[in-house]
């Protein structure tokens, strides 16, 4: 697995460059964490043709997975920034169950689904850090999360590999707009 | 052809123990997941336990009626599934069928063993 | 879990009508456009035998007079044209989710 960002040799070898800002940290683990999906999506194209299914099928879907939305304001176009920052943190709180239960559903990437299972985690906190509203922020039930966990693995083969490619899109895809946000930020 | 053969079923008396096999042929035995599943005229059919192979890692479940009594087991270099049984009750008189859940949800069984707890 | 309420419990069809079996589950058992309702048939002294996999896909060998339909949480099998050889057990079953769960039941006669 990739050295998660701020382990790198090279930050040891040139003690001399200025630190990260706050928002370049942000900025390199959120890419951090994309390198690591591709790797993931790559291991899930590999396996089945999930990779393969329309736009209509994963659409047909009962997972509740978060989504950027007008009213978060986090596109160009009504951009808030305060309700942003809270609608990418609570999006990613929601995320972590999902990312739990890709931790064994991988072979050859295992360790890899662990680094951006825990590096999902130093982010929320880079992220809560920056906010000024925490109160805004609302955390997951623990019981539901439990009860959801289980129902997903208990799914059969087919819809497991389907659950996981669609986290995997949607996870990628709500990074990539929390990216573009914060560097609005 | 996809094919199964239980054995081990009998006469057992409430309490005792018993071991059912169920050896697979016709299809990558290793790569699906497999069940036992029970019938009687009491409760109709009724799944029993599965034992899933999923990234190298085994995940096992059982129905609620067989938790803690029953256990699940594979051997896949013998294409074979087990079911051990202990503490049997007359409520767990049945025909018991190996089948293989298939990735599409199409399931396969075996003809059956059958299973008579009684004093 | 689960639940799945097949109906009737028992039918009597004359030779070469249509026979229409329900089955309405408890919750959808379909997700990404796909629904993991299988439909079997069994004679006595034999295991089940799969007609019907994913609604409607019918198990191989299995003559086209049987066909599935529905989706969500409400399914049939069709039986047209009724055939002497039709007169057995039918089950639906669930393969959404751990515990796998089956319906009651409908035996299926000869009018």
């Known amino acids: 697995a990739p050295v998660p960002p701020g382990e790198d040799s090279k930050d040891v070898a040139a003690p001399h460059r200025q630190p990260l800002t706050s928002s370049e940290r942000i900025d390199k683990q959120i890419r951090y964490i994309l390198d690591g999906i591709s790797a993931l999506r790559k291991e899930t194209c590999n396996k089945s043709n999930m990779c393969e299914s329309s736009k209509e099928a994963l659409a047909e879907n009962n997972l509740n997975l978060p989504k950027m939305a007008e009213k978060d304001g986090c596109f160009q176009s009504g951009f808030n920034e305060e309700t942003c920052l809270v609608k990418i943190i609570t999006g990613l709180l929601e995320f972590e169950v999902y990312l739990e239960y890709l931790q064994n559903r991988f072979e050859s990437s295992e360790e890899q689904a662990r680094a951006v299972q825990m590096s999902t985690k130093v982010l929320i906190q880079f992220l809560q850090k920056k906010a000024k509203n925490l109160d805004a922020i609302t955390t997951p039930d623990p019981t539901t999360n439990a009860s959801l966990l289980t129902k997903l693995q208990a799914q059969n083969q087919w819809l497991q590999d389907m659950t996981t490619h669609l986290i995997l899109r949607s996870f990628k895809e709500f990074l990539q707009s929390s990216l573009r946000a914060l560097r609005q930020m | 052809e996809v094919k199964f053969e239980e054995s081990g079923g009998g006469l057992v008396q409430p309490g005792g123990s018993m071991k059912l096999s169920c050896v697979a042929s016709?299809?990558?035995?290793?790569?699906?997941?497999m069940n036992w599943v029970r019938q009687s005229p009491e409760k109709g059919l009724e799944w029993v336990a599965e034992i899933r192979l999923t990234s190298n890692k085994q995940a096992i479940y059982y129905a609620e009626s067989v938790k803690g009594r029953f256990t699940i087991s594979r051997d896949d270099s013998k294409s074979s599934v087990y079911l051990q049984m202990n503490n049997l009750r007359a409520e767990d008189t049945g025909i018991y069928y190996c089948?293989?859940?298939?990735?599409?949800?199409?399931?396969?069984w075996g003809q059956g063993t059958l299973v008579t707890v009684s004093s | 879990d689960i639940v799945l309420t097949q109906s009737p419990a028992s039918l009597a069809v004359s030779l070469g009508q249509r026979a229409t079996i329900s089955c309405r589950a408890s919750e959808s058992v379909g997700n990404f456009g796909i629904s993991f309702m299988n439909w079997f048939q069994q004679k006595p002294g034999q295991p089940p035998k799969l007609l019907i996999y994913t609604a409607s896909n019918q198990g191989s060998g299995v003559p086209a007079r049987f066909s599935g339909s529905g989706s969500g949480t409400d399914f049939s099998l069709n039986i047209h044209p009724m055939e002497e050889d039709d007169s057995a057990m039918y089950f639906c079953?669930?393969?959404?989710?751990?515990?796998?769960?089956f319906g009651g039941g409908t035996k299926l006669e000869i009018k």
């Open positions: 089948a293989s859940l298939f990735y599409d949800g199409y399931l396969h």
């Open positions: 079953q669930q393969s959404k989710e751990i515990p796998w769960t």
């Open positions: 016709g299809f990558s035995f290793s790569n699906y997941w």
